[in-house]
Amino acid sequence: LQDPCSNCPAGTFCDNNRNQICSPCPPNSFSSAGGQRTCDICRQCKGVFRTRKECSSTSNAECDCTPGFHCLGAGCSMCEQDCKQGQELTKKGCKDCCFGTFNDQKRGICRPWTNCSLDGKSVLVNGTKERDVVCGPSPADLSPGASSVTPPAPAREPGHSPQ
């Protein structure tokens, strides 16, 4: 004598006031868990959203964004315009990163270049709008007696010359 409503499976709802206790979800609706009193309306991927996965009776549709946009928020609740690398999106559109900052992606904000001197290192490769600086070895790493990354070349035996 189990409670029939709580046993209505996913893809149905408890439509107890008709001949059937559990009825299939109507078109364009779904129930992802059992025991539902109603089915939820399927999400529609319109405009800048496009359908990544169709709605079924047991699962909602999933959207992603049309080319030139990327998803934001849980379940791609928003689409945000892409910018080029070296840019960030502002209220006025895509703007180049200011000097001293970079963005290596089509989304997100421009971030400051790494300050190599904070780690006692030197700049090996300068930063650009699209790329962070590359820090080189610290001056201490270049001083005599410091362990070298490359092993010394083996000494030749005397009296031998290359053939």
Epitope: L1, P4, N7, N16, Q20, I21
Partner: antibody
Amino acid sequence: SLEESGGDLVKPGASLTLTCTASGIDFSRRYYMCWVRQAPGKGLEWIACIYTGSRDTPHYASWAKGRFTISQTSSTTVTLQMTSLTAADTATYFCAREGSLWGQGTLVTVSS
Amino acid sequence: AQVLTQTPSSVSAAVGGTVSISCQSSQSVYSNWFSWYQQKPGQPPKLLIYSASTLASGVPSRFKGSGSGTQFTLTISDLECDDAATYYCAGGYNTVIDTFAFGGGTEVEFK
């Protein structure tokens, strides 16, 4: 716990109302309450079920619909109204909550 | 109305042995709405298994429910004297009329 009451010795054609009283269960909440009967020395026979705290359609056995009526009468009671009783309705009547909690039953005897 | 045919109607078993009780439904049970009950004389039924195979609270794992659709089985292993009782199956159907039906019962006794 659940306790049935109202069982009696009645004549054929009579009507009788059985009451299922709950202790520690609030029927203003949604529960699935059922009536089941058992004739002496026989098996279990399902009669009807109702969702308490709800206006949902009750569920009936086809043989019981029209002659038996299940209803919630308060936050602690569910009743079974029985009409046009015959000797075949002689049985112990149990109420149950979702099959997992049962009362001890009340005996209805229909005899002239 | 739906009919649940339970077999055998009685079985004589040995302590420590195993018994299997079958229940066949005239119509497919909806979404595994299927239960097994144990009843001893003078007592109300006790829920053993629901949703075809889920053990009710406090029921030993010696009781096992299986099956789907129209055919279901209750298996009791390592039988104990306390298992002497009548066992009933109950099926649920997706209709507001004749939502449930009980099987005729199987009496388990000991040799």
